[in-house]
Amino acid sequence: VPRWRQQWSGPGTTKRFPETVLARCVKYTEIHPEMRHVDCQSVWDAFKGAFISKHPCNITEEDYQPLMKLGTQTVPCNKILLWSRIKDLAHQFTQVQRDMFTLEDTLLGYLADDLTWCGEFNTSKINYQSCPDWRKDCSNNPVSVFWKTVSRRFAEAACDVVHVMLNGSRSKIFDKNSTFGSVEVHNLQPEKVQTLEAWVIHGGREDSRDLCQDPTIKELESIISKRNIQFSCKNIYRPDKFLQCVKNPEDSSCTSEI
């Protein structure tokens, strides 16, 4: 008799999820000498242990603690780049500027990037059919709790000047409900972080507006200032040119003409 299976509103676990996580772990630890000591089988076991046999609407940060412990990693605390709704450009940037790090440049972020996963209560099966959607089903699902946990830890580790890349093409450039707005902003440590510098990325070729004056940016500035952290904002009018000029700052096309 086929077992009844809970139908969730979100997509199911990414196909070949265990193999993908294990392969990514092996690749990451080969590329990053400081993480060579990591045992990827243990990492997978800890990852699996966080959600297998558990109700996918009842996951806690505590469930991920064994994985967090195994994935402990020190990144230079003054070289952190946060992002919101503009992941691809943030990753392109850290590929060029190799001494800066997004969450997805760390082992745990790299393992889970773009993947979905969930299990079922009381069975050891992975659910490849559907997983809970954050809005329609529940917020304490395996994926959301994972990202909340690693994002909080990443923000807590930051120091000095922290940078955040924001999407200037969206109606809410700063969104209080994003992971950045709901988790990272509130977990920056004022005793360690001097300044949050926002980079507002412009989409339009001819867009010369000062998006640092946008009401949502002013809201971000207010939240940050109340937390005793200085705030700074830059308009990145030409993101393609910005990446090119980060690569080669001496290129004459990077300097304003007199």
Partner: nanobody, 115 residues
């Protein structure tokens, strides 16, 4: 909040010298972007008069070849030699990048040259 504040202005006789200074914070954009000195004479638009790249490559408006722009990790400096009355203006420092917009403009520093 203003991250760029020019200082060092004042009144000087024609032929004299002044050195303007501008500190900026440790954000990444300043570290990788060209910086510039701008000036705004009474009744005129603000104009870019000198730029310097991260590596120290400089460029000047023809009329200010007497000036020398320099920078380190936190400061951009403008050494103004053989000053003339037409150099009277408010001077500002800011980014001089084709990719990144100018930062919030500070108060600037006033230079007055009398003949």
């Amino acid at each position: 909040d203003v991250q760029l504040q020019a200082s060092g202005g004042g009144s000087v006789q024609a032929g004299g010298s002044l050195t303007l200074s501008c500190r900026y914070s440790g954000g990444f954009v300043f570290r990788v972007s060209s910086m510039g000195w701008y000036r705004q004479a009474p009744g005129n638009q603000r104009e870019l008069i000198a730029t310097i790249t991260v590596g120290g490559k400089t460029n000047y408006k023809d009329s200010v070849q007497r000036f020398i722009i320099s920078r380190n990790d936190t400061t951009v400096t403008l050494q103004m030699n053989r000053l003339q009355p037409e150099d009277t203006a408010v001077y500002y420092c800011n980014l001089a990048s084709t990719a990144v917009g100018a930062d919030t403009w500070g108060q600037g520093t006033r230079v007055t040259v009398s003949s």
